[in-house]
Structure formats: structure tokens, C-alpha cells
Interface confidence: low
């Protein structure tokens, strides 16, 4: 004989000894009908705010307040947004590994430093976890007796540098 609790809709609860479908009380929900109890709705407070309010059939969904991001399944905790020099992983904010950087606040991933030598340029300023390498001008390969004319700004009377 089919128990009438089996016919209960989501948003209700039902006890086997009194098989009547009853609506979930306020601040509770039941996504599956026929359960003996409704579940207490999640409250989004503190560093959480409501993404979706609770209904009789669905739990509330939380998200993190400005400047924080979710961690864990169903946003079980809030962690401060990553700062430059870090990237967000499943384990939270992690410092960029050597040779990589992230110059963005709260978002982005660690990217490899620019390889200046691929463009035939020298490293003018070394990179950090927050900043990319600064490449210098292209490296000029001098042949003997090359003359470079250096003209200071604001005047034509230049200097000659003889490279032997």
C-alpha cells in the first residue's frame, strides 16, 4: 500500500504516523516532498549577503560582500579578494611563483614574465610577483669601427663615441 507521504510536494513535510502533507514553517524549506522535517534556511550575514532568498522549496544562496570571494561548496566561507602578486586557487589566494606576476586587484591569474631575449632585448628592470619585467631597447650588435652619434636633447652639437 502506497504511503500518502510519497505524494507530498516539495515545500512540505510529512510524518509516517500521521501521513498528511504539511507546509514547511517559515524560514524552512524542503526541496524533496515527503521528508519528516523541513530544513532550516541558511542565513546570509556578516561577510555574506543573499544571492537568492529562501523559499519553501529552496534554500537561500549566499555570496560574499564587496572585496571578498567565495570558498568551498555553496560559498561556505568568504575570503578577502586576492591582491596584486597573488592568484585565486581552490585553496584560496596564493602568491605568484617565481617568474610569474599578477598586477590586478581581486582578479586575474599569475602570468609568466616577458622573455625580453625573444625580442632581442635586454632586461631593464627585473620582474616581481606584482609587476612584469621591463625590457630595454633592442640590443645592438656592434661590428668594429661602428660609430654611434649621441646628440644631447636640445642641441645639435653631438658627441661621437667610437666603438673599436
Amino acid at each position: 500500500v502506497q504511503n500518502s507521504c510519497d505524494n507530498c510536494q516539495p515545500g512540505t513535510f510529512c510524518r509516517k504516523y500521521n501521513p498528511v502533507c504539511k507546509s514547511c514553517p517559515p524560514s524552512t524549506f524542503s526541496s524533496i516532498g515527503g521528508q519528516p522535517n523541513c530544513n532550516i534556511c541558511r542565513v546570509c550575514a556578516g561577510y555574506f549577503r543573499f544571492k537568492k532568498f529562501c523559499s519553501s522549496t529552496h534554500n537561500a544562496e549566499c555570496e560574499c560582500i564587496e572585496g571578498f570571494h567565495c570558498l568551498g561548496p555553496q560559498c561556505t566561507r568568504c575570503e578577502k579578494d586576492c591582491r596584486p602578486g597573488q592568484e585565486l586557487t581552490k585553496q584560496g589566494c596564493k602568491t605568484c611563483s617565481l617568474g610569474t606576476f599578477n598586477d590586478q586587484n581581486g582578479t586575474g591569474v599569475c602570468r609568466p614574465w616577458t622573455n625580453c631575449s625573444l625580442d632581442g632585448r635586454s632586461v631593464l628592470k627585473t620582474g616581481t610577483t606584482e609587476k612584469d619585467v621591463v625590457c630595454g631597447p633592442p640590443v645592438v650588435s656592434f661590428s668594429p669601427s661602428t660609430t654611434i652619434s649621441v646628440t644631447p636633447e636640445g642641441g645639435p652639437g653631438g658627441h661621437s663615441l667610437q666603438v673599436l
Epitope: 556578516g46 568568504c78 578577502k80
Partner: antibody, heavy 117, light 107 residues
Amino acid sequence: EVQLVESGGGLVQPGRSMKLSCAASGFTFNNYDMAWVCQAPKRGLEWVATISYDGSTTYYRDSVKGRFTFSRDNAKSTLYLQMDSLRSEDTATYYCARVGAGDFDYWGQGVMVTVSS
Amino acid sequence: DIRMTQSPVSLSTSLGETVNIECLASEDIYSDLAWYQQKPGKSPQLLIYSTNTLQNGVPSRFSGSGSGTQYSLKINSLQSEDVATYFCQQNNNYPYTFGAGTKLELK
């Protein structure tokens, strides 16, 4: 209302052990990292340890590493600080605290631990 | 460890005055700074987190500012209930560290 109530303090001899407890109520305990902070007159406030919301990760200050063990029972909304090989410099008031944005947004009333022979 | 140097150590002032307490970090803490108030025989209470965000229920006469290594707590129009010791705390990196405190008294 968020409440944190510590217990288990008292007088203990150097080298012996003591276990502190902290009962939490008024918030969803398993959503929050928790911490112990101590305060001694000459040293001021010192962070002791932090435990992640699910108990999977713990962090300790160097001076207690290997001697103190921080654990939690989310079903009971309770924290524990097992303190072994106690030293005179561990004498302090110990507070359990809820971790907010790295800060400690709620504190218990504190429990005194005196390590002396 | 990041050292937090708080100044002044103590401060004697009058009701209605404006109070400034400074906190200097030994390295950049990227605004990960909190301020606490502690009254005698009581546990500390969070006033401000993330440099300038007021904790719920904290009067608006309290404000925080700063960046990099330098931070400050300002109390406008001092009230008698503000007499306490104030601590700064960095939570940028473990181990989290506190300043030694500033004891605020009335003249």
C-alpha cells in the same frame, strides 16, 4: 547574539598539560575560521593559532608549534586547545575569537592560564 | 614577523577632543589592518577592519585610514565611554601581530 565562552583554565606546573574549550553560539559555527589569542601583561596581545572553518587546516605561532593542538567539533560548536609541555611564558589570559576578514570580530571573555611550580 | 609599532603609548585628553593614534608596520601590509578597543577587565572588541571599515554597531566618531606601512585611528569628539586601550593588528601575513597598545585617559 554571538557568544564565545572559554573554560578549562587554571594553575598548572611547567611541563604539564592543560586543555581549553570554547563553546560558540549565535552564528553558523561551521562557516567561520576560529582563533585563539592570548594576552600577558608584559607581552600584550599575541595571536596563538587559527583553525579553518572545516578543521582541515591549522596555523600556529612558532613558540607553540609542536606543543599546542587546535581542534574543533562542528557538531558541538566547540573549539579545543590542547596545551602540552607548558612553560612559564605560556602564562596569559587566553581568548577564543571568531575570524572575520583576518581580524577577530568576536571574542570570548577569556580564561586565565598560570604556569608555575 | 611583521612588527607593529603603535604611538603614542599613552594619551591624556579631554572630552570632546579629537584623538589620533598611529600604527606603523615594519613592511607593507596592503591595508590588512584592524583596530580594537579594550576596557579594563574586558576582552578586546573590534572597531575597524580592513583599515577603514567600521564594524557593525561602532559609533561613526571612530574612523580609520592609511595604506602601505602607515595607519591611523581617529576618534572625533571623545566621549567618556571611549576611555580604554586601543590596539592595531595586521592580518596580512602569519603570524598575525598586534601593536603594544595606546592607553587613552581623561585629563
